[in-house]
């Protein structure tokens, strides 16, 4: 028969014959021959291959370096890489999460729209009319101004985006 020019899925062409790729978690030792199938061996401890492959070496699992603020979120297997995330209060600087930076705080006049995670920074938003934030915080949302009316008080000093209203007693008009 004619030697193949293309192979099926999960196969590769070598020396005019189709050999099976190694399954995830295994590396290639020897191509198939006329006598035997492809020879593959399992990846070792702290190694992985995540696809059907013809790699002769497995990849090393990512190291989550605590000196860079990293910790293991998900331990790697022979078929998956380790996933790193950042320590509490820090977030990754990139999608690959190779280092961490401190979460940003929202300045006075701004509140937290979305609290930071291990992979995303704090998202701040300006406090709209009727709301304020008087602290620099990575957690505090904008607080609504105090409602003087519900306390049977009146506004003595208007609120801003950084300060609450100041309430005071109503002036009692005598007849």
């Amino acid at each position: 028969p004619e030697p193949p020019t293309a192979c099926r899925e999960k196969q590769y062409l070598i020396n005019s014959q189709c050999c099976s790729l190694c399954q995830p978690g295994q590396k290639l030792v020897s191509d198939c021959t006329e006598f035997t199938e492809t020879e593959c061996l399992p990846c070792g401890e702290s190694e992985f291959l995540d696809t059907w492959n013809r790699e002769t070496h497995c990849h090393q699992h990512k190291y989550c370096d605590p000196n860079l603020g990293l910790r293991v979120q998900q331990k790697g297997t022979s078929e998956t890489d380790t996933i790193c995330t950042c320590e509490e209060g820090w977030h990754c600087t990139s999608e690959a999460c190779e280092s961490c930076v401190l979460h940003r705080s929202c300045s006075p006049g701004f509140g937290v729209k979305q609290i930071a995670t291990g992979v995303s920074d704090t998202i701040c938003e300006p406090c709209p009319v009727g709301f304020f934030s008087n602290v620099s915080s990575a957690f505090e949302k904008c607080h609504p101004w105090t409602s003087c009316e519900t306390k049977d008080l009146v506004v003595q000093q208007a609120g801003t985006n950084k300060t609450d209203v100041v309430c005071g007693p109503q002036d009692r008009l005598r007849a």
């Epitope: 030792v29 020897s30 191509d31 021959t33 006598f35 035997t36 020879e39 061996l41 399992p42 002769t56």
Partner: antibody, heavy 116, light 110 residues
Framework: QLQLQESGPGLVKPSETLSLTCTVS??????????WGWIRQPPGKGLEWIGN???????YYSPSLKSRVTISVDTSKNQFSLKLSSVTAADTAVYYC????????WGQGTLVTVSS | QSALTQPPSASGSPGQSVTISCTGT?????????VSWYQQHPGKAPKLMIY???KRPSGVPDRFSGSKSGNTASLTVSGLQAEDEADYYC??????????FGGGTKLTVL
């Protein structure tokens, strides 16, 4: 058809270093198989795995022989070699080279005697 | 790592079946499906008969079969023939690019 051939001195003195070479013909040492191994068999005894080498030089040795074994590769000559240091009479054996970790191709073996 | 355990000898008459065992641990035989069996005639190099527990290289008679249960692998030779008389060795992958052989079994055809 792939063929492997061991070569080297048949007699080595105690405390010296045993050196053998395996020449691969009928195929390249850096394609079709990427790992190559050494196995030995003392007279009248069983097989013992010595170690393997990746064609780019990474080595894997038997824990029991690790401190005395060096396996190297020369892709330009299509050869890989075994060195075993500080030999004693217990290292007298037929030494085989073979393909991969599965060992589907073997050399015919060479007897190395350790004696003064 | 210790050698895998094989019976020193086994025998059978022509036409019969013989099974040779190869016992290891969960770190080798039990941990991986990478058991091979080799046949060695006196003065010759070993020949691969079974790989990955039960696969036969083409050219090896189907009288030879392999299996595994737990930490023990087995080679069965059915329909024994005179030329099957030889030494048989098992080997197993033992993790971290390490291999271990069995001590060998001398098969006699009576």
């Amino acid at each position: 058809q792939l063929q492997l051939q061991e070569s080297g001195p048949g007699l080595v003195k105690p405390s010296e270093t045993l050196s053998l070479t395996c020449t691969v013909s009928g195929g390249s040492i850096s394609s079709s198989s990427y790992y190559w191994g050494w196995i030995r068999q003392p007279p009248g005894k069983g097989l013992e795995w010595i170690g393997n080498i990746y064609y780019r030089g990474d080595t894997y040795y038997s824990p029991s022989l690790k401190s005395r074994v060096t396996i190297s590769v020369d892709t330009s000559k299509n050869q890989f070699s075994l060195k075993l240091s500080s030999v004693t009479a217990a290292d007298t054996a037929v030494y085989y080279c073979a393909k991969g970790f599965r060992f589907d191709y073997w050399g015919q073996g060479t007897l190395v005697t350790v004696s003064s | 790592q210790s050698a895998l355990t094989q019976p020193p000898s086994a025998s059978g008459s022509p036409g019969q079946s013989v099974t040779i065992s190869c016992t290891g641990t969960s770190s080798d035989v039990g941990g991986y499906n990478y058991v091979s069996w080799y046949q060695q005639h006196p003065g010759k190099a070993p020949k691969l008969m079974i790989y990955e527990v039960s696969k036969r290289p083409s050219g090896v008679p189907d009288r030879f079969s392999g299996s595994k249960s737990g930490n023990t692998a087995s080679l069965t030779v059915s329909g024994l023939q005179a030329e099957d008389e030889a030494d048989y060795y098992c080997s197993s992958y033992a993790g971290s690019n390490n291999l271990v052989f069995g001590g060998g079994t001398k098969l006699t055809v009576l």
